[in-house]
Interface confidence: low
């Protein structure tokens, strides 16, 4: 589990209708995920076996899953 | 109002290399991935990656790997994609997208001698 | 790679008609975050892409609510209501839970 720490996450349902998804991969989730924080929304990521986990991206609005 | 701006069309000779610019404007640029998609004559979509403006960190779909180039340019909220050694199969319609939600017209590659 | 398969192929539909769509996922869209990431865009003849709807079932502003999605899991529709001629063109759902991003290969509707 994880949480969403930006302070542009209370931001986002303004603009709830504007952006979608924007993350995705494969086999394994990510812990992490980078959120669309003006514009909305938040994609899946998930990751190869072989790829390392991005990074947490604060300032980013990135949410643990 | 988001925009997504590309050039219309590219013509490149087969073992050449093209790159294809994105700019956009009407959201924080650094707030969603910059996406590839392309789609050949005819055709329907693929995938070809993501790239992350707020710290340029890339996704590229495996067919792709080792021969196509992601940037971001956050001075000019301006994102590239180099493609090289082309082949005609890789004429194509390359759009970008603010992570499927926003998507750019789409600049024509033409590959051909 | 996650692949979805969309179908019919093509439709032919008369104005006023309803038409569905269907996108069949080979695992469940759903991430570990809850979400699902499932899109459906709207390519018209010479055109580019647009988003009608994301997870699974919200309408971006400005689409018609003659546009429906639905469906969980593995398996998704497009409803559309009351066909008009500028709904022709080719439907494609979408997902990016994971990577590979991957498409449908796409619905062409023709208005009769």
């Known amino acids: 589990g994880g949480s969403c720490g930006s302070e542009h996450y209370n931001m986002t349902s303004e603009f709830e209708e504007m952006l979608g998804g924007s993350g995705g991969s494969e086999d394994i989730y990510l812990e992490e995920r980078k959120t669309i924080k003006v514009l909305g929304g938040s994609g899946g990521s998930v990751e190869t076996d072989d790829q390392s986990p991005e990074k947490i991206n604060i300032l980013g609005g990135s949410c643990g899953s | 109002e988001v925009q997504l701006v590309q050039p219309g069309a590219e013509l490149r000779n087969p073992g050449a290399s093209v790159k294809v610019s994105c700019k956009a404007s009407g959201y924080t640029y650094t707030s969603a991935y910059i996406v590839w998609v392309r789609q050949a004559p005819g055709e329907g979509l693929e995938w070809m990656g993501r790239?992350?403006?707020?710290?340029?960190?890339?996704k590229y779909a495996q067919k792709f790997q080792g021969r196509v180039t992601f940037t971001a340019d956050t001075s000019t909220n301006t994102a590239y994609v180099e493609l090289s050694s082309l082949r005609s199969d890789d004429t194509a319609v390359y759009y970008c997208?603010?992570?499927?939600?926003?998507w750019g017209k789409g600049t024509l590659v033409t590959v051909s001698s | 790679a996650t692949m979805l398969t969309q179908s019919p192929g093509s439709l032919s539909v008369v104005p006023g008609e309803s038409a569905s769509i269907s996108c069949k996922a080979s695992?469940?869209?759903?991430?570990?975050?809850?979400?699902?990431?499932l899109y459906w865009l709207q390519q018209k003849p010479g055109q580019s892409p647009q988003r009608l709807i994301y997870?699974?079932?919200r309408r971006g502003s400005g689409v018609p609510d003659r546009f429906t999605g639905s469906g969980s899991g593995t398996d998704f529709t497009l409803n559309i209501s009351d066909m008009k001629a500028e709904d022709a063109g080719v439907y494609y759902c979408a997902q990016d839970t994971y990577y590979p991003y991957s498409f449908g290969s796409g619905t062409s509707v023709e208005i009769k």
């Open positions: 997208t603010a992570g499927l939600d926003y």
């Open positions: 695992q469940s869209l759903v991430h570990s975050d809850g979400m699902t990431y």
């Open positions: 997870r699974v079932s």
């Open positions: 790239i992350d403006p707020e710290d340029g960190g890339t």
